[in-house]
């Protein structure tokens, strides 16, 4: 099964401070961050489509989620599957197409005021704090009204960047996804060679802020390809 591939037990670089500078070499950490397969289904045509193996939703496209292709099938074999549209069954938010979220086991529109709220108990992913299952049962708890209308602050658990407040993006931090600051000018950024490759990172940086792009630092042009430092620079 794919689980046997989950053996990448070292994190080569420690993360930079939130929204900050580059990491430093660090000691190995026991981790199984996901499967680093080359390519992805982003550039595969329909007539040449091959299922893209995955371990995390982030490894799939924005209109996909990671799951076993057959219900009750081998839990170890997971591939990127097309997201579920409104009124389709779901088990977690990532299964629903953008603009929807999983409520009571059904994908529903997120165009409701309370969806944007940072939920009590520092939750931004649970949206209404429902206990959602495929069976569709729900145990609602009362939310304080002051929590509605506010988006996730720095460090809040999130699903997508739209869950985070202005100036923040939703990025992976080891086994969780949290709101992190969008990068400022001069800060180190990650240049993705391939669309979608950001999902493979254990520690994910945000993108560069408005008017900035992630480009190789001028004084690093002579460095080897692998050690080139990218920073957020003005267009």
């Amino acid at each position: 099964t794919l689980n046997s591939v989950l053996n990448s037990n070292a994190i080569k670089n420690l993360p930079p401070p939130l929204g900050g500078a580059a990491g430093h070499p660090g000691s190995a950490v026991s981790a199984a961050p996901g499967i680093l397969y080359p390519g992805g289904n982003k550039y595969q045509t329909i007539d040449n489509y091959q299922p893209y193996p995955c371990a995390e939703d982030e490894e799939c496209g924005t209109d996909e989620y990671c799951a076993s292709p057959t219900r009750g099938g081998d839990a170890g074999v997971q591939i990127c599957l097309a997201c579920r549209k409104r009124r389709k069954r779901c088990m977690r938010h990532a299964m629903c197409c953008p603009g929807n979220y999983c409520k009571n086991g059904i994908c529903v529109s997120s165009d409701q005021n309370h969806f944007r709220g940072e939920i009590e108990e520092t939750i931004t992913e649970s949206f209404g704090n429902d206990h959602s299952t495929l069976d569709g049962y729900s145990r609602r708890t009362t939310l304080s009204s002051k929590m509605y209308h506010t988006k996730g602050q720095e460090g809040s658990v999130c699903l997508r960047s739209s869950d985070c407040a202005s100036g923040l993006c939703c990025a992976r931090h080891f086994w969780s996804k949290i709101c992190k600051p969008v990068l400022k000018e001069g800060q180190v950024c990650t240049k993705h060679r391939r669309k979608g490759s950001h999902g493979l990172e254990i520690f994910q940086r945000c993108y560069c802020g408005e008017g900035l792009s992630c480009r190789i630092q001028k004084d690093h042009h002579q460095a080897s390809n692998s050690s080139r430092l990218h920073t957020c620079q003005r267009h």
Epitope: I11, G34, N129, W175, I202
Partner: antibody, heavy 118, light 107 residues
Framework: EVQLLESGGGLVQPGGSLRLSCAAS????????MSWVRQAPGKGLEWVSA????????YYADSVKGRFTISRDNSKNTLYLQMNSLRAEDAAVYYC???????????WGQGTLVTVSS | DIQMTQSPSSLSASVGDRVTITCRAS??????LNWYQQKPGKAPKLLIY???ALQTGVPSRFSGSGSGTDFTLTISSLQPEDFATYYC?????????FGGGTKVEIK
């Protein structure tokens, strides 16, 4: 209300195995990363392992790497910790905890006691 | 691994006292610092996350500050129910590590 309830602890001989379970309710379990944290009698807290919401990524403390396996069944809202080759130093109260903001442990179970003794 | 050093390891105080506990990380952890309260025989309870954010339901007499390597938990006016052990924890880089704890006892 978020609730986490651990079970499966008990007395086991050195070299033996145990499987701990943590039943979760009151929140959308599949959306949250979860961890196991332990506390030896009279000692401080020690993080043991963590798993992402989908179960695709697992992390371990060096002290348990290769012996413990964290897993989850999102259809059952349950977190597991399979503990093999148990040692005396593994004896502790084991808590399951949910990952909240800044990867803090925002909700904890009541704990289950694991005793390793011959 | 990142070492978390808490001080003092224990302190005696009276109801109404202002209590300060410090936590130092062996390297910068940005604001990935959380504080917990634990009473005997009970599970820990989250007080402060992200160095300074008060967890929902926690009394406002608890506050946290700091960034980088040095952090502080302050109880502005100690109440009878605050006598417990307090732990800091870094969540910046695995393995997540806790401080040794500070036991707050009645004077």
């Amino acid at each position: 209300e978020v609730q986490l309830l651990e079970s499966g602890g008990g007395l086991v001989q050195p070299g033996g195995s145990l499987r701990l379970s943590c039943a979760a309710s009151g929140f959308t379990f599949a959306n949250y990363a979860m961890s196991w944290v332990r506390q030896a009698p009279g000692k401080g807290l020690e993080w043991v392992s963590a798993i992402s919401g989908s179960g695709g990524s697992a992390y371990y403390a060096d002290s348990v790497k290769g012996r413990f396996t964290i897993s989850r069944d999102n259809s059952k809202n349950t977190l597991y910790l399979q503990m093999n080759s148990l040692r005396a130093e593994d004896a502790a109260v084991y808590y399951c905890a949910r990952s909240g903001s800044f990867l803090s442990f925002d909700s904890w179970g009541q704990g289950t006691l694991v005793t390793v003794s011959s | 691994d990142i070492q978390m050093t808490q001080s003092p390891s224990s302190l005696s105080a009276s109801v109404g006292d202002r209590v300060t506990i410090t936590c130092r990380a062996s390297q910068s952890i940005s604001r990935f610092l959380n504080w917990y309260q634990q009473k005997p025989g009970k599970a820990p309870k989250l007080l402060i996350y992200g160095a300074s954010a008060l967890q929902t339901g926690v009394p406002s007499r608890f506050s946290g500050s700091g960034s980088g390597t040095d952090f502080t938990l302050t109880i502005s006016s100690l109440q009878p129910e605050d006598f417990a052990t307090y732990y800091c924890q870094q969540s910046y880089i695995p393995p997540l590590t806790f401080g040794g704890g500070t036991k707050v006892e009645i004077k």
